[in-house]
């Protein structure tokens, strides 16, 4: 039971992973616009995103401005919305290979196979989290390293926005949810008890192990 | 006291490089960005760019990206600029000109200049 | 970029009078402006900075007012050493960008 319980919550982890990427990607919080110092009163906040930008008005007003031309816009931020789309592609594919190969599916029946597509999802989850986590960092460095720069302009000096710190969020679930469906599946390949597969085949008897009887050394 | 000193007048022809030096002192060199603002005859004053003699990083204005290449010796407290391939409206002082390292980006203490002409 | 524009060119104020300066950006520059004083023949000097911030050894007859997109340089008395072309300069935004001068002159 140990075993379906990790997968359960790594998928859990995974799915709350993919949806935090999705929100990260899609807000235009990536960066908020500083204005420091001389006690402003500032009269608006820009947000800028990967695919908008947005001026909120102190009123509460916002504007947005989708981006025109994609070949017009920064190489970085062109290479942030490409990894922020495939990982969460990436994450989906996971999550079928997951599916697949779940205990509680008979998509795939034998046991070997359901460990190696258990394992496999959890890798690609991981690989997910990785390619989550390379956009978000590299535009925080770029946001860090301007703001300290004191050769730029403060107009062009920027916060890190909601959408960063939701990417590493996102990044965090992926990477152990990811871990978490790795460390399911046990190096020898035989999948954990057999009862998960009773309720699939009529000749299985209806007879579950005791408690004793699992190979512990399976889900240290 | 605090002094900018810029290397002699020029005269180069069009398509050539010029490299002009400000060599510093009175002050901590690496507690203030250089920079270089230009000034054609009878002209305003026009920021070039400029760079952080802490590690070398460089902000240039983008009418001379590519053309311009501002650099440091922190051993000799001096900065150096050099302008590529040089056209008659390049003719212009030259000067250096410092930004406290915390502080706003406008010019405390200038460079005399330096009178680069470019003539065929 | 930030567009500078300083009004009027040239000014010609009697010894004593007052003397205006505009300078008006092309967007908000949240005060993030300086003026420069550059004399025939020397190199630009600064008087303000912050809009309105007096540099130390600056005599008290200049003054600097102003906010968002318009600002103002102001002589109250006029001496003959203020004969010169002033500047202004706006650090908000890259590149940085200087207007197109004021020459001031004795009437």
């Known amino acids: 039971m140990a075993s379906a319980g990790m997968q359960i919550l790594g998928v859990v982890l995974t799915l709350l992973g993919w949806v935090n990427g999705l929100v990260s990607c899609a807000l235009p919080m990536w960066k908020v616009t500083a204005f420091i110092g001389n006690s402003i009163v500032v009269a608006q906040v820009v947000w800028e995103g990967l695919w908008m930008s947005c001026v909120v008005q102190s009123t509460g007003q916002m504007q947005c401005k989708v981006y025109d031309s994609l070949l017009a816009l920064p190489q970085d931020l062109q290479a942030a919305r490409a990894l922020c789309v495939i990982a969460l592609l990436v994450a989906l594919f996971g999550l079928l290979v997951y599916l697949a190969g779940a205990k509680c599916t008979t998509c795939v029946e034998e046991k070997d196979s359901k460990a190696r597509l258990v394992l496999t999802s959890g890798i690609v989850f991981v690989i997910s989290g990785v390619l989550t986590l390379i956009p978000v960092c590299w535009t925080a460095h770029a946001i860090i390293r301007d703001f300290y720069n004191p050769l730029v302009a403060e107009a062009q000096k920027r916060e890190l926005g909601a959408s960063l710190y939701l990417g590493w969020a996102a990044s965090g679930l992926l990477l152990l949810g990811g871990g978490l469906l790795c460390c399911t599946c046990p190096s020898g390949g035989s999948q954990g008890p057999s009862h998960y597969m009773a309720r699939y085949s009529t000749s299985a008897p209806a007879i579950s192990r005791g408690p004793s009887e699992y190979p512990t050394k399976n889900y240290v | 006291q605090v002094q900018l000193v810029q290397s002699g007048a020029e005269v180069k022809k069009p398509g050539a490089s010029v490299k002009v030096s400000c060599k510093t002192s009175?002050?901590?060199?690496?507690?203030?960005?250089m920079h270089w603002v230009r000034q054609a005859p009878g002209q305003s004053l026009e920021w070039m760019g400029g760079?952080?003699?802490?590690?070398?990083?460089?902000h240039y204005n983008q009418k001379f990206q590519g053309r311009v290449t501002i650099t440091v010796d922190k051993s000799a407290s001096t900065a150096y600029m050099e302008l590529s391939s040089l056209r008659s409206e390049d003719t212009a002082v030259y000067y250096c000109?410092?930004?406290?390292?915390?502080?706003?980006?406008?010019?405390?203490?200038w460079g005399a200049g330096t009178l680069v002409t470019v003539s065929s | 970029d930030i567009q500078m524009t300083q009004s009027p060119d040239s000014l010609a104020v009697s010894l004593g009078e007052r003397a205006t300066i505009n300078c008006k950006a092309s967007?908000?520059?949240?005060?993030?402006l300086a003026w420069y004083q550059q004399k025939p023949g020397q190199v630009p000097k600064l008087l303000i900075s912050?809009?309105?911030s007096l540099e130390t050894g600056v005599p008290s007859r200049f003054s600097g007012s102003g906010s968002g997109k318009d600002y103002t340089l102001t002589i109250s008395s006029l001496q003959a050493e203020d004969v010169a072309v002033y500047y202004c300069?706006?650090?908000?935004?890259?590149?940085?960008?200087f207007g197109g001068g004021t020459k001031v002159e004795i009437k």
């Open positions: 300069q706006q650090y908000w935004s890259s590149p940085l960008t």
């Open positions: 000109a410092r930004i406290y390292y915390f502080g706003r980006l406008y010019f405390d203490f």
């Open positions: 967007e908000d520059i949240y005060n993030r």
């Open positions: 912050g809009a309105t």
């Open positions: 009175g002050y901590t060199f690496t507690e203030y960005t």
């Open positions: 760079i952080d003699p802490n590690n070398g990083n460089t």
